[in-house]
């Protein structure tokens, strides 16, 4: 049976076996054509998603879709049902959590006040004054909270306490990217952890230990890219795994939330990398032990130099690592989060592609995971 | 230097196929994407797929699906595109370029398809 | 697929002058866009990509502008050997699409 299911993939009628390699070759093997069914998908970017969050104190603003313009939710007469809409057009499927914060000094959009329309925020008609003062802070998820802070060193053994929204993507049981949990259902990785093996049955998920193979596997239900850019073959390198069942969140699984939509870090804001991955480059071996390190934003321009990256990494890609080298992720880190301290942890990269590993002028490239909020939240709304 | 060579013009009659190659030198073959992009005579430029030669995958316009096929030889550093069904539309210059950054930086001459009874 | 127009279609000038063309796309495009000069009987040759980063060998009087959905090229002190016919190309997502061209001609 073992060895059946390994080399093997059982078409329905009439019932008969087919190699294994034949899965999401693009060919119909099967007569009803399920070989090619639970592959990797990919997803559009699709049309813009009418709200957002600002990272100005997780602040709600709505898009008036006839001209274009953005603008911020008054608190006045924000409701529940409202919060749960504006959530929902975001893909989220928990109980979300609001409050009003006072109108800044720096408040560049106009305030409206905000009403529904067939299950989409809209702005009142005859919107007045904000009489509150006050703006929507809005949170759909709680994420972003773990058990222990880590301390601010190079490169360390890191415990599940600390970065409890790691899992481990593995294939056959073999470890081969890391990723983010995101919510109940879904985990955030890269595309190209993806590229060898398409057909969604044989990956499987490691949520809530440190070490590499000591924790129950959980099935996936689909795997979804973004379009293929062939232009920027190293762009658009994004995936989200939706889980078969939902996780049941603890201290050691725990999701971490999705950047805000205005989040530009500059250049040497402290960051930090996790993962399994190899600790030297061609060092032929994963660590079994989670590891975690701190480094910082590097500019795009100096990425971007003649002796770096000579202008292949896109707005849609940010750098990281330490000015002098030798702290980077590595071959198997890829797919793991690139994260963000504020109030939460916040998942700003996705580890994603670089030339060797710790090169001082060659740092780590990184998915830059606020240029496809809009991709997540339509890929979740359609699988909600 | 880095160069891409075309194989020389071709005629053809309606319906059959003809194949183009592309041969590279002068840079590590399987690092970058080729290209294929098209121009009818007096007319603008129209892409019509990609190949890895590294991995071998590819891509084609909509356009062309089905009708186009690319493949390469990494003995030889040359990419191939083939175009069956032709029709007198597809009288055009082919040429392959390489991927660079969003752009393409080399072109191959240009190989000359006429299509014609 | 994402529309590129340019205008003008075509344009006369002369040896010193300079010269703009724009290129609008039908949608966002960040700044994912690539300028190409062609010049009779020969292949396109690249001079900006990511609308404004010169690619290398290509002369200073050559210049990108542009994001979103409106682009410029420019050329400062127009040459003879810069009267050819230029291309907009966007790479924001496949299929990559053209303008369909503004010939400069000489006055």
């Known amino acids: 049976k073992v060895i059946l299911d390994k080399y093997y993939f059982l078409c329905g009628q009439p019932l008969h076996f087919i190699p294994r390699k034949q899965l999401c070759d693009g060919e119909l093997d099967c007569p009803l054509g399920e070989d090619e069914e639970h592959c990797v998908k990919s997803f559009p970017e699709g049309p813009a998603v009418a709200v957002r969050l600002s990272k100005d104190r997780s602040t709600l603003q709505v898009l008036d879709s006839a001209t274009g313009n953005w603008f911020s939710a008054c608190f006045d007469n924000f409701t529940e049902a409202l919060a749960e809409t504006a959530c929902r057009q975001m893909g989220y499927s928990s109980k979300p959590t609001f409050r009003a914060v006072e109108i800044g000094p720096d408040q560049d959009l106009d305030v409206v006040e905000i009403t529904e329309n067939s299950q989409e925020l809209r702005m009142r008609n005859s919107s007045g004054p904000c009489l509150s003062g006050s703006l929507v802070s809005l949170h759909c998820l709680a994420c972003g909270k773990s058990l222990k802070t880590p301390r601010v060193v190079g490169v360390e053994e890191a415990s599940v306490d600390s970065w409890p929204w790691q899992v481990s993507i593995q294939y056959d049981k073999q470890h081969v990217c890391g990723g983010s949990i995101l919510d109940p259902h879904w985990v955030l990785t890269a595309a190209h952890c993806f590229r060898k093996h398409t057909d969604v049955f044989n990956w499987k998920v490691r949520a809530g230990s440190d070490k590499l193979g000591s924790f129950p596997s959980l099935a996936v239900a689909k795997i979804i890219i973004i379009e293929f850019n062939p232009m920027y073959p190293k762009d658009n390198d994004i995936a989200l795994m939706k889980l078969q069942f939902p996780l049941t969140f603890s201290g050691t699984v725990r999701p971490i939330c999705l950047p805000f939509f205005d989040e530009e870090l500059t250049p040497a804001t402290p960051l930090w990398i996790i993962g399994w991955g190899f600790t030297k480059q061609n060092g032929g071996k994963m660590s079994d032990i989670l590891l975690q390190a701190s480094v910082q934003v590097i500019d795009s321009t100096r990425c971007n130099a003649d002796d770096a990256y000579q202008g292949e990494v896109t707005e849609k890609m940010m750098c990281a690592g330490i000015p002098e080298g030798g702290v980077d992720t590595c071959q198997g880190d890829s797919g793991g989060p690139l994260m963000y301290q504020s109030d939460q942890w916040h998942v700003v990269g996705i580890v994603s592609w670089g030339y060797g590993c710790g090169g001082p002028s060659t740092p780590g490239v990184y998915t830059k995971v606020s240029a496809y909020l809009n991709w997540i939240y339509n890929v979740w709304k359609a699988e909600l | 230097q880095v160069q891409l060579v075309q194989s020389g013009a071709e005629v053809k009659k309606p319906g059959a196929s003809v194949k183009v190659s592309c041969k590279a030198s002068g840079y590590t073959f399987t690092s970058y994407y080729i290209h294929w992009v098209r121009q009818a005579p007096g007319q603008g430029l129209e892409w019509m797929g990609w190949?890895?030669?590294?991995?071998?995958?590819?891509g084609y316009a909509q356009k062309f699906q089905g009708r186009v096929t690319m493949t390469r030889d990494t003995s030889t550093s040359t990419v191939y595109m083939e175009l069956s069904s032709l029709r007198s539309e597809d009288t055009a210059v082919y040429y392959c370029?390489?991927?660079?950054?969003?752009?393409?930086?080399?072109w191959g001459q240009g190989t000359l398809v006429t299509v014609s009874s | 697929d994402i529309q590129m127009t340019q205008s003008p279609s075509s344009l006369s000038a002369s040896v010193g002058d300079r010269v703009t063309i724009t290129c609008r796309a039908s949608?966002?495009?960040?700044?994912?866009l690539n300028w190409y000069q062609q010049k009779p009987g020969k292949a396109p040759k690249l001079l900006i990509y990511?609308?404004?980063r010169l690619q290398s060998g290509v002369p200073s009087r050559f210049s990108g502008s542009g994001s979103g959905t409106d682009f410029t090229l420019t050329i400062s002190s127009l040459q003879p050997e810069d009267f050819a016919t230029y291309y907009c190309q966007q790479s924001y997502r496949s299929p990559p699409t053209f303008g369909q061209g503004t010939k400069l001609e000489i006055k």
């Open positions: 990511a609308a404004s």
């Open positions: 949608q966002g495009i960040s700044s994912y």
């Open positions: 190949m890895s030669p590294n991995s071998g995958d590819t």
């Open positions: 370029a390489r991927l660079v950054r969003g752009g393409f930086d080399y």
